[in-house]
């Protein structure tokens, strides 16, 4: 996402089609308060950022309310009146969906259905990852609505779960960001647990009669 213009690297994140965050890293201007100017319509005058992000006391980014805005962000990063980086970008390329909310678990024997509130826009994947202390890595299952059923679980094992949302690559392109993970929740025998033991307890030896 960065640019070669005067050594300025940029990063754009479009949070949940609501807020755009543009951050910059400009080694040449590391002790300078660069200013950020933007517009959502190519015909309008630029506005200056009113919500700067600071790093070590200097501007390093801008947060913009972009809800119900057009799809293109035109922006200019300036040192005084001198533009050091100018660009226009389709914002959806940099979509980061919000983290799943109201995550619920419904158990039935050796299966669990994980649900959460669907986001208000489409073409998303809802991914559930889960593991027991016996698993060396996370298992994963995803669906295009937040209704994911995982079968073949062992009722006696404790499982950790977390959920996130991803933008479909075929729709939004490959350079989007997955949401943050939901909080990890642990379940055993259909009941919530504080945690799953890090190391599985060894099976009890069978007593000979």
């Amino acid at each position: 996402q960065g640019g070669a213009a005067e050594g300025v690297q940029i990063q754009i994140i479009y949070f949940n089609l609501e807020t755009v965050q543009v951050t910059w890293n400009a080694s040449k201007y590391s002790r300078t308060n660069l200013t950020f100017h933007y517009r959502f319509n190519g015909d309008e005058a630029y506005d200056q950022c009113t919500n700067y992000l600071l790093q070590e006391g200097h501007t390093s980014g801008c947060l913009l309310d972009a809800e119900q805005r057009d799809d293109i962000l035109y922006f200019s990063i300036r040192n005084g009146t001198h533009p050091v980086f100018t660009a226009s970008r389709w914002m959806v390329y940099y979509l980061k969906p919000s983290s799943p909310k109201h995550v619920r678990f419904s158990w039935h024997q050796d299966a669990v259905t994980v649900t959460c509130s669907d986001l208000s826009y489409g073409d998303l994947l809802y991914e559930v990852q889960y593991r027991s202390p016996f698993d060396t890595e996370w298992q994963s299952k995803q669906e295009n609505t937040c209704n994911v059923t995982i079968e073949g679980l062992d009722a006696e094992k404790c499982y950790s779960f977390w959920v996130r949302v991803k933008a479909m690559e075929d729709v939004y392109g490959p350079d989007t960001y997955p949401s943050d993970w939901s909080e990890v929740t642990c379940w055993q025998r259909g009941e919530i647990r504080d945690a799953c033991a890090e190391t599985p307890t060894p099976p009890k030896p069978k007593l000979s009669k």
Epitope: A4, Q9, I72, Y93, V171, Y172, P174, D175
Partner: antibody
């Protein structure tokens, strides 16, 4: 499979206007998620994106051309149109209509028409 | 606008050769770079989308790589039908822009 056929090209005098048509078959131009675009290719072979019209009728134009072009569509005829005014010699090109990949306006163009040649000359 | 620069502008090669064409963007574009092939008198045809994904029906001798600002299109073993002009295109920047083209000719 989508087929696109452009028409309306020909010889135009400088200062004149043109209206190009693009008839789509095998696919509805109102299908959600797809955007339709006009791209032109100059005699020197360079390609220039001109503008989009979406399944939702939203339009986007190349800022360099915005004041001179209008893209529209007729759903009943499953066709799109390019209106271009104040033509000059440097507008001489082959004009293509094309469809973007699913997911919209922002991607690559996977189906193209055969193109129609517009020559601007007195 | 994001400038796209292809190199070389023209290239002579023989059937069976391995050929690489490069495309450089004036600003980083992630992996949103697409490649087209155009034969004389025909419209461009999409070969590769998003830097490395082969479009349906395109032979596997074509491959793409790169991210950020530097990208390559490789034809592993040239076939007679591959002699054509190749264009790259970026899509996250507005407006979308194309490279000037690389003409691949028979040696």
């Amino acid at each position: 499979q989508v087929q696109l056929v452009e028409s309306g090209g020909g010889l135009v005098k400088p200062g004149g206007s043109l209206r190009l048509s693009c008839a789509a078959s095998g696919f509805s131009i109102t299908t959600s998620g797809y955007y339709w675009t006009w791209i032109r290719q100059f005699p020197g072979k360079g390609l220039e994106w001109m503008g989009y019209i979406g399944y939702n009728s939203k339009t986007y134009y190349n800022p360099a051309l915005k004041s001179r072009i209008t893209i529209s569509r007729d759903n009943a005829k499953n066709s799109l149109y390019l209106q271009m005014n104040s033509l000059r010699a440097e507008d001489t090109a082959v004009y293509y209509c094309a469809r973007s990949l699913y997911g919209g306006y922002k991607d690559a163009f996977d189906s193209w028409g055969q193109g129609t040649l517009v020559t601007v000359s007195s | 606008d994001i400038q796209m620069t292809q190199s070389p502008s023209s290239l002579s090669a023989s059937v069976g050769d391995r050929v690489t064409i490069t495309c450089r963007a004036s600003q980083s574009i992630g992996t949103s770079l697409h490649w087209y092939q155009q034969k004389p008198g025909k419209a461009p045809k999409l070969l590769i989308k998003f830097a490395s994904r082969l479009q349906s029906g395109v032979p596997s001798r074509f491959s793409g790589s790169g991210s950020g600002t530097d990208f390559t299109l490789t034809i592993s073993s040239l076939q007679p039908e591959d002699f054509a002009t190749y264009y790259c295109q970026q899509s996250p920047g507005f407006p979308p822009t194309f490279g000037q083209g690389t003409k691949l000719e028979i040696k």
